[in-house]
Every structure is written in C-alpha cells, then in structure tokens.
C-alpha cells in the first residue's frame, strides 16, 4: 500500500500592517484587510504571540513623518515580552536624531530585521517614541516575521 | 530495491543588482553578471516574475546621492503587477524628505524587505522617484527575494 | 523493522552583537552572551565563516551616533575573504552623507540585508568607515546570516 | 490652556537692535516649534523664520538672513527674535506662533509686539 | 518662493450671504495626496487665528460655516451665510516649503 500522504505543515509567517487608531505603545496593527498574513501566530493586542518554539526572521519598518520639523528624538523598537520573565528584552533598535533641517517637511523611515530564537508564548511588540509622528500606511508601516 | 533519489527542488531565488543604463521606471536591472542570483524566477523588463504561488521575502536597497543636496523628495517603492488586476499594488514603500544640508555633497540609503504571498504571473518592479540621484553599484543598489 | 530516525540538519544560523572593544577593522561581535545566535557556523576573529556552500540571506545594522555632528562620511559594508581570491569582495555597503546638523547631537542607522551564493570557507565581515561613532548596544548593531 | 506671550512695545533707533521674547505655557514646550512672523502697519504677513525648541537650530527667511537670530531657553520655555540694524521699514507688529510637527499649520499665535523704528 | 496671490482685496457682502474668498499659488503646494494650504482670519488689533488647515479641514472651534477647497494652485474659502463677527480680513498661506508665504489678504466688508 502506498505510504500515508505527508502532512504539509502550515508556514508560520505574519505580515501585519499600519493601523491609524494606535493611541498608545505598543503600536497596534491591522491583523485582517489588505496586503496582510497571519498563519500558525496569534495576534493579540499589537502582539505577535509565538505558539512554536524555534528560530525566526523578524522585521519591521515604521515611516516617520512631521510638518515642521523639530527633530524630536525618533526611537523603534521590536521587543519581547514573555510571563516568565520580569523585563521587557528589547531585540532591535533603531533611534535617530538630528536628521532634518528645522521648520521643514520631513519624512524618515526606520527599519530592522534579524534572527532570533523564539520560545512558544513569547509575544512580540514593536514602540515608537513619537506616536503622533508616525503615518500608518500599509506599504510604509509593517512588523512581520517568519519562522526559518 | 533502494528507493529513487529524492529530487532535490531548486530554491526559488533572485538577487539581482544596480543598472545604471536604466533610463526610466520601472528600474531595470543586471541579471548575469557580478553576485546576482536568478534561479526558478524569471526576470523580465525590470521585473521579477513569479512562477509559483506561495510565500516569498521580498527585499531592495537604493543608494541615493548628489553632488548638491537640494532635498528632492525620494521615494523608493516596490510594487506588484498582474493582468487579474487594472492597478499595481504598492507592496512596500520607503520615502524621503528634508534629508541633508542644502548645498553639501550627500548620500542616503532606503532598504525596505517583508513577506507577501505571490501568485504565479506576478511580476514585481521597483520605482524610484528620481532616476538621476540613483547610484547603481552592485552592493549599493539591489532587488531580491526567495521563496519561503 | 520501522526506518531509521530522520536526522533532522541544525539549522545554519547566526546573529552576533556589537562588542564595544572593537578596536580596528574588521568590527568583532559578541558570539557567547546575551540573544546571540551561532549553529552551523564558526566565528573566527570578526568573521563568520560558512562551513557548508548554499544559498544564505546575510544582514547587519550600525548604529552611529556622535555628540557634535560633523557630518564625517560614514560607511557600513558586508564583505567576503575566501583564500582563493585575492581581493575582499563588497556584498552590500550602505553610504551616508551630510545626514546631521552641523554641532549638533546625532544617530542614525544602517541597515543591510540580501540573499548570497555562498561557499564553504568564506569568511564574511562587517567594516564601518568611523569605528569611534559606532554604538555596540545589542539591540542597535548586530550581524547575522542563515541558511535558506 | 496654551499661551504664547510675548514681550511689550519696543521703539529703537534705526541701526539699533531688538529682541522680542515668547513664553509659552500649558503644552509640552518642546514638542512645538516656534514661528515669527511679522506685520507692517496697514501690511501683509511676513514670515521671518522658524526655531527648533528641542534642538535650538533656527531656519530663517533669506530676506532677513544675517540679521536676525532666534535663540531658546528650554528652562523658562522661552523662544527669543532678535533683529539687527533696524530701519523704518522694520517697524511692525511681530508674532510667534507655535507649529505642531504632525500638523499643518501655526494653530497658536502670541499676542503680538509692536516694535517703532524712528528717529 | 512660492507666491500666493489672493483676489478680490475688498470683497463687500451683505450678512447672511455666502462669501467666496480666492487664493493662486505660482506652484502646486500637494504633496502625497495633501494641499499644504491654510487659511487664517484676522481682525484689527488682534493676531492671526487658524481656520483651514490642509485645504478643506476645519480648525477646532471654528463655525462650520466656513469651508476651504482646492487642490494644486487653486483654493477657495467660502463662508456660507456670514454673521456679524466674520468681517475681518482673511490671508491664505502654504506650509509646502521654506519659506512659507501668505496672501496680501482679502479684506471682507459689511455691504
């Protein structure tokens, strides 16, 4: 008899995208229309909660924009939170300052990227430092992550 | 008996790098010499073009620069196209303003990479707002992506 | 008699950290503490060395920083030795340019990140062109690969 | 409630010079910068320049460059105009306004300050 | 620069009727999908006070009598049926660059 056809195992991969009604850290994400992915991770409160141990590719960009600018310290930050521990683990950091001319139209990106080795129920969150400067577009603002 | 070697699938891939012969958008790209890779993706007319549906990293870097920064708004986009659909779709974007000191020599870099799941006669292009700030170097300026 | 256990390959991966006693090129990383990340590959005096040819997604960010902006040209390359060659071959580099105001406090980062071919005793690397401006926190410069 | 107020009537003596003060109350001072713009009698209005209260570097309006200079003290969440070499034609009313980085527009003025050039 | 160019100087208009209020930039002030256009109103002995930031959207605490619109180089303020109190002169002015500019100003006056 031929062998049991093999179970295709589900990629564990998120793509999640801006979402303009963030009022508070961490930022929150759109987790359903448009360009997004969300298979084998949970979505839970702007987090993305890890339900398999293993290594995994995390990224994310935030687009950063003002009017006049005053070159407030800009910082991003993709951060680990997980019951077992007390503390917040910052994983990827990005901060900039000084980077536009006073009074001008400015926009900037931040981007991070990188593998880390993540336990099932660690979430994961992503913090700007200047919410009101932050435009949410789904092609400019995302967090994701893959599982290697 | 022993049983047939297992066939080993090529890895879907591309990194292909900086033309400098581009003369408008989409951009156009080198696809035989220097540290590109193409293998079961097929590259057409400054795109990429998939030829199986599933997950893939998608990623570019631009280099940007001048001789005498007039703070042109930047933009560097990667976006998809496919007959099923009358509009691209802007997969990732990255832009730039007020960037560096009026009058001064100077260079940026916009590097955008996240995950989207393709379909097969996608093809996907980058955009740059100004062709003649781009510099085309192979490790300056490239497009790639590889399927999960 | 039921087969054998599939022997299931450790993934080739690893993510190392800013070590602040760099001194001169090429940057050293933290390869033991902390969210450090090294399997299947050797660290060898700043340099990951690739243990088993294939295809590799290799990144790194810097983070520079200074206290009174002089718009010093920084740069930030990922380069590849392999005792065949007689020259450092560039992967990815990143250039920056009047990105400050003149006096002021300042940071900015550097992110590269793309697929490359690699062989069996490669060593890769990471330069920057102003070591004194580089910070070495975890979370701000790192560098890693993995295997696809 | 946010308040911008600046500094009373000055009358200067052309080649003179005059520094205008703005302190500004009941929002976070340094999250704003701070515009001047100016008004001759019977006239338009004039933009003169902008400062970065976080950072303390001015950009100003080529029309005025190397005469004016706009400085901030972060302790008394004060932003300073000071011009130079005065003439006739500098006599006006001279506001601050503040500008919300993620706004589009100067949405709190100052009172005002009237500065005579005259002899 | 950008010079902007208001019309008509005086406009004179009885209350309760509609005003319509021009302003020409000598280049497009859109930038990504938003019109850097403002609109202030101000009256004698008192500073400028916002009304119309981005072209069309309305300051907090402003009547929504007013209303800006436009795009490019071409925007209008109208004031539905003006009051008493809307008799003051109006500047338009782009924040699309350094240096920002205003209008000469449109004076509104009691027919």
């Known amino acids: 008899p031929s062998p049991p056809p093999e179970k295709k195992e589900l990629r564990k991969v998120a793509h999640l995208t801006g979402k303009s009604n963030s009022r508070s850290m961490p930022l929150e994400w759109e987790d359903t229309y448009g360009i997004v992915l969300l298979s084998g991770v949970k979505y839970k409160k702007g987090g993305l909660v890890i339900n398999e141990t293993g290594l995994y590719f995390v990224y994310s960009k935030v687009y950063f924009r003002g009017q006049s600018c005053n070159n407030l310290p800009l910082s991003h930050k993709v951060y680990m939170r997980n019951s077992k521990y007390p503390q917040d683990l910052v994983m990827m950091e990005g901060k900039m300052m000084s980077y536009c001319t006073t009074g001008q139209m400015w926009a900037r990106s931040s981007y991070l990227g990188a593998v880390f080795n993540l336990t099932s129920a660690d979430h994961l969150y992503v913090n700007v430092s200047e919410l009101s400067l932050v435009n949410f577009e789904e092609s400019q603002t995302f967090f994701g992550l893959y599982k290697l | 008996p022993s049983p047939p070697p297992e066939k080993k699938e090529l890895r879907k891939v591309a990194h292909l790098t900086g033309k400098s012969n581009s003369r408008s958008m989409p951009l156009e790209w080198e696809d035989t010499y220097g540290i590109v890779l193409l293998s079961g993706v097929k590259y057409k007319k400054g795109g990429l073009v998939i030829n199986e549906t599933g997950l893939y990293f998608v990623y570019s870097k631009v280099y940007f620069r001048g001789q005498s920064c007039n703070n042109l708004p930047l933009s560097h986009k990667v976006y998809m196209r496919n007959s099923k659909y009358p509009q691209d779709l802007v997969m990732m974007e990255g832009k730039m303003m007020s960037y560096c000191t009026t009058g001064q020599m100077w260079a940026r870099s916009s590097y955008l990479g996240a995950v989207f799941n393709l379909t097969s006669a996608d093809h996907l292009y980058v955009n740059v707002s100004e062709l003649s700030l781009v510099n085309f170097e192979e490790s300056q300026t490239f497009f790639g992506l590889y399927k999960l | 008699p039921s087969p054998p256990p599939e022997k299931k390959e450790l993934r080739k991966v690893a993510h190392l950290t800013g070590k602040s006693n760099s001194r001169s090129m090429p940057l050293e990383w933290e390869d033991t503490y902390g969210i450090v990340l090294l399997s299947g590959v050797k660290y060898k005096k700043g340099g990951l060395v690739i243990n088993e040819t294939g295809l590799y997604f290799v990144y790194s960010k810097v983070y520079f920083r200074g206290q009174s902006c002089n718009n010093l040209p920084l740069s930030h390359k990922v380069y590849m030795r392999n005792s065949k060659y007689p020259q450092d071959l560039v992967m990815m580099e990143g250039k920056m340019m009047s990105y400050c105001t003149t006096g002021q406090m300042w940071a900015r980062s550097s992110y590269l990140g793309a697929v490359f071919n690699l062989t069996s005793a490669d060593h890769l690397y990471v330069n920057v062109s102003e070591l004194s401006l580089v910070n070495f926190e975890e979370s701000q410069t790192f560098f890693g690969l993995y295997k696809l | 409630q946010v308040q911008l107020v600046q500094s009373g009537a000055e009358v200067k003596k052309p080649g003179a010079s005059v520094k205008v003060s703005c302190k500004a109350s009941g929002y976070t001072f340094t999250d704003y910068t701070i515009h001047w713009v100016r008004q001759a009698p019977g006239q338009g209005l004039e933009w003169m320049g902008v400062?970065?209260?976080?950072?303390?570097?001015?950009s100003y309006n080529q029309k005025f460059k190397g005469r004016v200079t706009m400085t901030v003290d972060t302790s008394t969440s004060t932003v300073y105009m000071e011009l130079s070499s005065l003439r006739s034609e500098d006599t006006a009313v001279y506001y601050c306004?503040?500008?919300?980085?993620?706004?589009?527009?100067?949405?709190?003025w100052g009172q005002g300050t009237l500065v005579t050039v005259s002899s | 620069e950008i010079v902007m160019t208001q019309s008509p100087a005086t406009l004179s208009v009885s209350p309760g009727e509609r005003a319509t209020l021009s302003c020409k930039a000598s280049?497009?002030?859109?930038?990504?999908?938003?019109?850097?256009m403002n609109w202030y109103q101000q009256k004698p002995g008192q500073a400028p006070r916002l009304l119309i930031y981005?072209?069309?959207n309305l300051e907090s605490g402003i009547p929504a009598r007013f209303s800006g619109s436009g795009s490019g180089t071409e925007f209008t303020l109208t004031i539905s049926s003006l009051q008493s109190e809307d008799f003051a002169v109006y500047y338009c002015q782009h924040s699309r660059e350094l240096p920002y500019t205003f209008g000469q100003g449109t004076k509104l006056e009691i027919k």
């Open positions: 306004a503040r500008f919300p980085d993620w706004d589009y527009a100067m949405d709190y």
């Open positions: 400062i970065s209260t976080y950072q303390g570097d001015a």
């Open positions: 981005a072209a069309s």
């Open positions: 280049q497009s002030v859109d930038y990504d999908g938003d019109s850097y």
